[in-house]
Structures are given as structure tokens and as C-alpha cells.
Amino acid sequence: AGVFELQIHSFGPGPGPGAPRSPCSARLPCRLFFRVCLKPGLSEEAAESPCALGAALSARGPVYTEQPGAPAPDLPLPDGLLQVPFRDAWPGTFSFIIETWREELGDQIGGPAWSLLARVAGRRRLAAGGPWARDIQRAGAWELRFSYRARCEPPAVGTACTRLCRPRSAPSRCGPGLRPCAPLEDECEAPLVCRAGCSPEHGFCEQPGECRCLEGWTGPLCTVPVSTSSCLSPRGPSSATTGCLVPGPGPCDGNPCANGGSCSETPRSFECTCPRGFYGLRCEVSGVTCADGPCFNGGLCVGGADPDSAYICHCPPGFQGSNCEKRVDRCSLQPCRNGGLCLDLGHALRCRCRAGFAGPRCEHDLDDCAGRACANGGTCVEGGGAHRCSCALGFGGRDCRERADPCAARPCAHGGRCYAHFSGLVCACAPGYMGARCEFPVHPDGASALPAAPPGLRPGDPQRYL
């Protein structure tokens, strides 16, 4: 366990041209406050993922009123550090988001108004117990200067705050195999007591009483090898003899999420989805109201009407979640019609339309036949974003410009000979066959296999069928 500490040194216009206008004015005095969000690992995730390591808000800074005509100076800052307590090991690598908020103190109906002035983000490596690290980050025309460090809370020590220290039992030296706790030389490293029976070869612990397994091992005491053979249940059957994964305690067993948070397992650990009004890795930070600026990404905070809606964030387009912390995958709603490709550009949605379609959502079916003539009496038929010509007899090709050979497909059956004719084709049938395509055999007794003839027609009269 320990605390991440952030000290803001200055927030003001960055170097170079285009100094920003002061966020406050004589008509609209304001004051600043800051919000920090921490996530473990060198996460590429931006503001929309939860602050799994924790979040903190500064106090409000002094009220500031712009001097007319003066450029924006460094703005007055809140006193003190921003502190983010962490209960587990310090991950060593982390991502941060620092937001600078403005609280306007004019005569707004319904109290002060908050707006996001700047957001900076970064990914850093940091050992707990080390010195303050200094940083400068720019957001548009603004520049934020700050320092940060992670420190362990006694009795934890070490770069990850996982080693424990205890006062020396003997005045001269520490027990066998135990080192002095730098920088607390009068204390000794305490042996970390893992869960009883935890495999010394395949298990380890970062906190007393736990047993975490090295890769390839599983079970409550890390004594069961993980097999790649087929297992019966999602975490494998419980028989240790199979070598399958034993359903030992899952990260969500016993629900580590406080205050009604719901737990979901992640590949590395667990994640708590907190009810409105609660924050933190385990939803342990409570009592959040609009005064704490809980809405991310420029969300507008309004007071809720009951204890379960302590505050309500009205999210700007593209964000959702009770704190506007999730970026909306707007393409998942499949807004592009007619097979268009959806592109979420952050500030806007774009649809890349298939041929034959247009419009912001590819909703317009272009007139495929507009300006496309079919030659030689063919007619244009629209369909599926393309046009095609239905050609008159004797013509073919995309635009009916090619003269078709009606006999090319060998349409005359039973050895009949085909002749091209201005109206199409004519079949000269071989002896014993008749019909427009020589498809009917003529029987020797004069009867034929033709369907029953209409009244007034003799079944054996071939020329009627040419």
C-alpha cells in the first residue's frame, strides 16, 4: 500500500505565439482545480477507461479575476498535494491523466459551472520510494508544470511497496536472511508470510496471506500445473489429477467491490463497475458530488434527485458512462447504410460509401442510369449501386453496343441447324424433331409428344410451331 502524490507547480500559457485568453474575467471570476486519474501499466487507453489505480481531486484554487488588457498569467493554484492512495502493489509503470478544471463563480442559475480547460496525459515508469520526478506537459496553448512521486505507507517498503518492515527485535542486526530496511536502517525487512501451503517454487505473494501463481501453475496453492489438454469447465475440472486448471478462488470471489460495485474478471485481475457516487479500484471512495468534478471529458455535472443519483453527468457527444468515462464506439450502431464503411474520427463520424451510394450515411441511392444510355434500343435497369442494360434481340455487351450472334449458344436441340435472322434465330430441325428449338420428337405414327393442342390445332402440324 502507498500513496501517489502530485504537486502542481504552475498552469499558464505555454511558450510561443497565440497566448490563450484568460479563462476568468471581471464579469466571470473563476478558480481552478485539478483532477488526476491513474491507471496501471503503460496503457494506451485514454480518458474513457476507468482510473483503476485511483483518482483524486484538488481543493479549489484562489478566486482569480482577469486584469483587463493583461495577458493570461500563470493562474493561482490550489494549495497542497493531490494524493491518490493505492492499496495493492505499486505497478512501476503507470498512465496518468491530469485535468485542469475551471469553476466559474458568476451568477449562474443553480450554482457554479464547471468546464474543462485542459487535459494532459502520459505514460511513465516510476519506482516507489524514489525522488520527486518533474514534468512539463502542454495542452493546446496551455502548459502544466508538475512533480510526482509514489511512496509506500509503513510497514510497506520497496520499489513496489510489497516488502514489509518491522522494528528490529535485536539492537544489532536483523534475523537470518533479512536485510535492513533502507532508508529505515533501524527496521528490518519482515518475512512476507504467504498463504499456508503456498508452493515456494510456483507461488509468490505481494501481501500476507495471498498465494499468486507463476505462469503455468494454478490452484489455490499453485501446486497444479496448467495443462493444455481439454478441460471440462471454464476454469477446468476440479480434479488435480487431470492437470487441468482448478477453479481456485477467482479474482471476483467474495466480491472485492465495495458500495454495491459489480465485479468482472479481467485477464490480469478484476475490475469494479462502481455505482454513481463511488470511485476507486474497489469503489471505496464515496460521497462524490458535483463539487468534486466527477464528470470526465467535458461532461456537464448536475445534482441528482436521490442518493443513488448523487450527481449526473451529461456527456458530450462521443462519450458515455456515469462519469462520461467511456468513449462511445459509435460505429457499433452501424450508422452507415447500404454497406458503407464507418470511420469514427473522434470529433465526427464518417461513412465511406460503396459505389452508387452517397450522403453522410450513404443513405442516397444514386440514379445509376442517369446519363447512361443503352445503345440499339436497350433499356437501363438500376440495381445494387450499378447499372446494367437489358438489350434488344440481337445485341449484347454492357451498353448493348455489341451485335450478338444468336446462334453462339447452340440453341437448336437434337442436331438442328441455327440461322441468324433479323428477328432472332430460326432452327432447321433434323428429321424426326420439331418445335422452335427442335425440342420435340415427332412419332412415326404421326402422333407427337407435344402437349395437348389448343382447339383447332392439329398436334402433328410442325410449321405452326416454328
Epitope: G260, S262, T273, V302, G303, D306, P307, D308, S309
Partner: antibody, heavy 117, light 109 residues
């Protein structure tokens, strides 16, 4: 537009039972706590019961006047809120409203429960 | 159990500003009571006006505003209209229990 439609009211004898239902539409019912509020003829409003959402373990709360007689429940899959009323008394005669608090208060049109011998 | 007290009746004139208040027997009303204001018109027509102390519901005229004045919650109607004549209830949350005031009958003469 959020809609709350109460049904199930009617005339019942003292010590009898009745189950009220409230069908909810146009908002994510599962996310929010829900309430029943009543108004006796010519009287003010009285909060009756509250049920929180799943992430708060469907915790329930009751006014002292109905405790151990009324049971509030919900069916998230159907977006339905219920009030099971047992051992009814004449003073339970009232218009019953399904009420949802979020940024402000949303009301149904109410259903009338009359307890009379 | 907490008791919530409102003025039983108030009278105002069109165009005047009137303030209705809501007192808690347990001490000062705070934002943690999530004060709500509800308007009742004839035929059991209820409208939520204000939630969370000062959050005006959509469609509610801007002349209605909610606030905390001293140790009480307040509903102010700036420039009352004849159609504002109604009964106004305030509700305060005490953790997960809601207590209503007795209602204020507002007459706009």
C-alpha cells in the same frame, strides 16, 4: 419520453391483499432505484417503499407505516416494478404512484387502492 | 423519524416573486438531502419541478428555481403567473428514506 404506468389497483376488504404493477419504458430501468409513493384522499404525499438496483443488491426500504405488510420488488428483464400489499388497512386507501428519481422526479398516473369493508 | 415542514399556504400576485421553503427537523437541509420540489394540480396531476436542490427539470419554466437559503431548501418563483396556482410539495432524502413536507397551497390572485 419516460413512461410509468401503474396497474392493479381496486377495491379490497381490510386484511385483504393486492399486488400493484408498474410498467416502465424509455429509460434504462436496471440502472436506477425505484419507489412507490401514495396520496390518501385530501392528504399530502407519503413515501411508501424503495428498491435499489442490482449493483446495490436490490436493497429495499419501507416507511414505518407499511413495514412487514408491503413488499417492493422488481423484474429488470421486463422493466417492471411491483408492490405486494398484504394485511391491508382502511388507512391504506390512497392513490399509489410509481416514482423514479434521477435528475428530477418522474411520476406515473397512479392507480387507486380502496380498502373498505 | 425526520419531519419536513412547509408553509401551509401562501398568496402572491401575478408578476411577484414568491419563495416557498422546506425545513428539516434534524437540522440544516444540505445537498445530501437532494431536495425535490413537486407541483400538484387538480386531478392528481404531478410534475417534478426541481431535483437535487437546484436542478430544474426540462420543460419547467425558468421562473422556477431551487436553492438552499440558510438552513432550508427553497423554491423561488420569479414573476409568478396565474397558472402557477397549485400545491407544492418538497421531499428530502435521509439516506434511503424519503420524507415529504405537508405541501404549500400557493394562490396567485
Amino acid at each position: 419520453e419516460v413512461q410509468l404506468v401503474e396497474t392493479g389497483g381496486g377495491l379490497v376488504q381490510p386484511k385483504g391483499s393486492l399486488k400493484l404493477s408498474c410498467a416502465v419504458s424509455a429509460f434504462t430501468f436496471t440502472t436506477y432505484a425505484m419507489n412507490w409513493v401514495r396520496q390518501a384522499p385530501g392528504k399530502g404525499l407519503e413515501w411508501v417503499a424503495r428498491i435499489r438496483n442490482k449493483s446495490n443488491n436490490y436493497a429495499t426500504y419501507y416507511a414505518d407505516s407499511v413495514k412487514d405488510r408491503f413488499t417492493i420488488s422488481r423484474d429488470d428483464s421486463q422493466s417492471m416494478l411491483y408492490l405486494q400489499m398484504n394485511n391491508l388497512k382502511i388507512e391504506d386507501t390512497a392513490m399509489y404512484y410509481c416514482v423514479f428519481y434521477y435528475d428530477y422526479v418522474y411520476w406515473g398516473q397512479g392507480t387507486l387502492v380502496t380498502v373498505s369493508a | 423519524q425526520a419531519v419536513v415542514t412547509q408553509e401551509s399556504a401562501l398568496t402572491t400576485s401575478p408578476g411577484e416573486t414568491v419563495t416557498l421553503t422546506c425545513r428539516s427537523s434534524t437540522g440544516a437541509v444540505t445537498t445530501s438531502n437532494y431536495a425535490n420540489w413537486i407541483q400538484e394540480k387538480p386531478d392528481h396531476l404531478f410534475t417534478g419541478l426541481i431535483g437535487g436542490t437546484n436542478n430544474r427539470a426540462p420543460g419547467v419554466p425558468a421562473r422556477f428555481s431551487g436553492s438552499l437559503i440558510g438552513d432550508k431548501a427553497a423554491l423561488t418563483i420569479t414573476g409568478a403567473q396565474t397558472e402557477d396556482e397549485a400545491i407544492y410539495f418538497c421531499g428530502l432524502w435521509y439516506h434511503n428514506h424519503l420524507v415529504f413536507g405537508g405541501g404549500t397551497k400557493l394562490t396567485v390572485l
